[in-house]
Interface confidence: medium
Amino acid sequence: KLTIESTPFNVAEGKEVLLLVHNLPQHLFGYSWYKGERVDGNRQIIGYVIGTQQATPGPAYSGREIIYPNASLLIQNIIQNDTGFYTLHVIKSDLVNEEATGQFRVYPELPKPSISSNNSKPVEDKDAVAFTCEPETQDATYLWWVNNQSLPVSPRLQLSNGNRTLTLFNVTRNDTASYKCETQNPVSARRSDSVILNVLYGPDAPTISPLNTSYRSGENLNLSCHAASNPPAQYSWFVNGTFQQSTQELFIPNITVNNSGSYTCQAHNSDTGLNRTTVTTITVYAEPPKPFITSNNSNPVEDEDAVALTCEPEIQNTTYLWWVNNQSLPVSPRLQLSNDNRTLTLLSVTRNDVGPYECGIQNELSVDHSDPVILNVLYGPDDPTISPSYTYYRPGVNLSLSCHAASNPPAQYSWLIDGNIQQHTQELFISNITEKNSGLYTCQANNSASGHSRTTVKTITVSAELPKPSISSNNSKPVEDKDAVAFTCEPEAQNTTYLWWVNGQSLPVSPRLQLSNGNRTLTLFNVTRNDARAYVCGIQNSVSANRSDPVTLDVLYGPDTPIISPPDSSYLSGANLNLSCHSASNPSPQYSWRINGIPQQHTQVLFIAKITPNNNGTYACFVSNLATGRNNSIVKSITVSA
């Protein structure tokens, strides 16, 4: 069937439209286009004869129409009058006629709208505002946007005049927003610039800050007032009812008890004509004395002496407070407070008790803190540490050993080699060492105040070659998927290359394997049962290369989900039931059985002779590994038929 399609159907003024013909018959003589829904010679636009390829304009031809050989009609520079129906009249070669009608609509391109308002400065809770979208346009739809969102549902918002007018009743400060209107028709949509609604409000009840109402004599009083208001409020201060100044802030330096009283802030909005006030009562107290701490022992010895700290001066009916390290007192059996909290006693002091300590006196207004006091606890020396940690040195290098022991006052150090005193210094330096410098190096640390001394002995070997290495481990029985293991290749030596092998192969590339400490330490993160292998470390220098004995990692794992065998679940009455349970586990797990939830025996094998249908039910094997602390189980249903 012959049809006409209008592309587009809705056409903007000044644009073009194509009347596209579908299913045009074969063997045509020609065709004509007419304005309207019927063939009317007075309204012919154009005719076309196929044989001559001749187009002939008709009375309704405007010069904007173009006809195509496929009968389609293009109309350019569309005007409003072009709206309507168009009829195609087709004359076939057998002179039989056929007709089809199409149509389109013409709409104007909309201008950019603007918003007019009946009240530029509405007052909160009093005024209404009507926004109107200009200009008024026929066949246009009007939309409104608030802060780029569609209109909220509110009984105070009303659309009228075909949505062209938006009225806000009883405006509030929250209506202060960006308003836009939009006009739409089938061919265009335009938005206005935004209009900001300026709602006058306030002042609200002012707030006075800071909130504290108690001050000490000699302090500065600095009060600030603020009230929500549009336009911003004008402020006035009154003290005990007497006007002071018209400012937002009130400042009185070096106050005395006489400055106690009622302080009023008044906020005024000149546009709304409203006033609001807030009153605060300020109390000024006389200054109490600053406390200080006295001690009965200025140099206590660790683990021997007690110290009593006393907060001075003694004042009747006063609360005393204490702080250690800027924290309130911890609960400790070594800390004791006297009945009035004025004396703090530390029993058997340790080096961690140095403080600082502060005491405080509490009055009506605040807490007065003492200056901090630090205890000089005498301690140590602890066992000295000798660094570096190398035990092997090659001939010809310089030996530089340093000794350190935690001590107060700092320790005095002495060095001995093979029992013979060398020097009284913290560091020992020997240049260009030979194998004769091998021996026992002793560092002795002495605390002159406590009279204590401690020693550490280190064996130093001077040799160009290295010994056979050995592997030390930080965890001999790691748990699978939980623990990490660090293997360290001993000894630690200068100018040495450290190498590792696993099961005789060089280390595999794995994110769980990490070398550190100059390759001397091999760490396995999140060990798995597959890590239970032989680990060997090697050391290499210019004259020696050797491997350690293998260390096999014993990874604790499991128990995995057990397996009950045989897999059969159906038995004949009178048969023997012999179930075996197995679970991969290291060490081997403990086994137990339950039948229908009732505990049975703690064995790996469950045997029941000459079973009957009474033995039907669920058979559960439970496994537990005491080393990993993990459990597992499996349930099997057994059916016995008569």
Partner: antibody
Framework: QVKLEQSGAEVVKPGASVKLSCKAS????????MHWLRQGPGQRLEWIGW????????EYAPKFQGKATFTTDTSANTAYLGLSSLRPEDTAVYYC?????????????WGQGTLVTVSS | NVLTQSPSSMSVSVGDRVTIACSAS?????MHWLQQKPGKSPKLLIY???NLASGVPSRFSGSGSGTDYSLTISSVQPEDAATYYC?????????FGGGTKLEIK
């Protein structure tokens, strides 16, 4: 398979110089140290020193300082011993020797030796 | 560090037990032993005082400490005829003993 192949015998006049080679196969010389030793007729073994082919570090026995020079060509996997100002008492079999890091120890792989005869 | 071996030579029968001594002029933590057959390169026999090198028969053993070390062959075999050297690697220069020549009667 680890193997050290040394260059052939040399006969030189006193005061002359000579350069001996030691080609390694079965391992990369950069992974190890190369030692040189010598053994005079009916004499004990003498250690000349070592070279680290990776960085060129060397250590010489005091007796051979100025007499011996160690070099390597890592691309050819070869170590060289240069001997200068030769005297009749330098007549000896010169050995190259090393121990791979896979060990267990150094001095477990030896070249077949190069006889150097110093004679006028 | 001078190494002195004794004896300098010895002649023994197959099956005999043989001990070769090596004395160091100053203390060393380890001693090593090499075997050299006539016309051949030396071969590592024992390292770090008592460890057998790869492929060395168990009849060979080493012991000692400080300045005195020894190599023992528990039951001499014909193929053991060779010169045996001790070696120290603790201090530079590395040094060798004068050698002990072992002959089989």
């Amino acid at each position: 398979q680890v193997k050290l192949e040394q260059s052939g015998a040399e006969v030189v006049k006193p005061g002359a110089s000579v350069k001996l080679s030691c080609k390694a196969s079965g391992f990369n010389i950069k992974d190890s140290y190369m030692h040189w030793l010598r053994q005079g007729p009916g004499q004990r073994l003498e250690w000349i020193g070592w070279i680290d082919p990776e960085n060129g570090d060397t250590e010489y026995a005091p007796k051979f300082q100025g007499k011996a020079t160690f070099t390597t060509d890592t691309s050819a996997n070869t170590a060289y011993l240069g001997l200068s100002s030769l005297r009749p008492e330098d007549t000896a079999v010169y050995y190259c020797n090393e121990g791979t890091p896979t060990g267990p120890y150094y001095f477990d792989y030896w070249g077949q030796g190069t006889l150097v005869t110093v004679s006028s | 560090n001078v190494l002195t071996q004794s004896p300098s030579s010895m002649s023994v029968s197959v099956g005999d037990r043989v001990t070769i001594a090596c004395s160091a002029s100053s203390s060393v933590p380890y001693m090593h032993w090499l075997q050299q057959k006539p016309g051949k390169s030396p071969k590592l026999l024992i390292y770090l005082t008592s460890n057998l090198a790869s492929g060395v028969p168990s009849r060979f053993s080493g012991s000692g400490s400080g300045t005195d070390y020894s190599l023992t062959i528990s039951s001499v075999q014909p193929e053991d005829a060779a010169t045996y050297y001790c070696q120290q690697r603790s201090s530079y220069p590395l040094t060798f003993g004068g050698g002990t020549k072992l002959e089989i009667k």
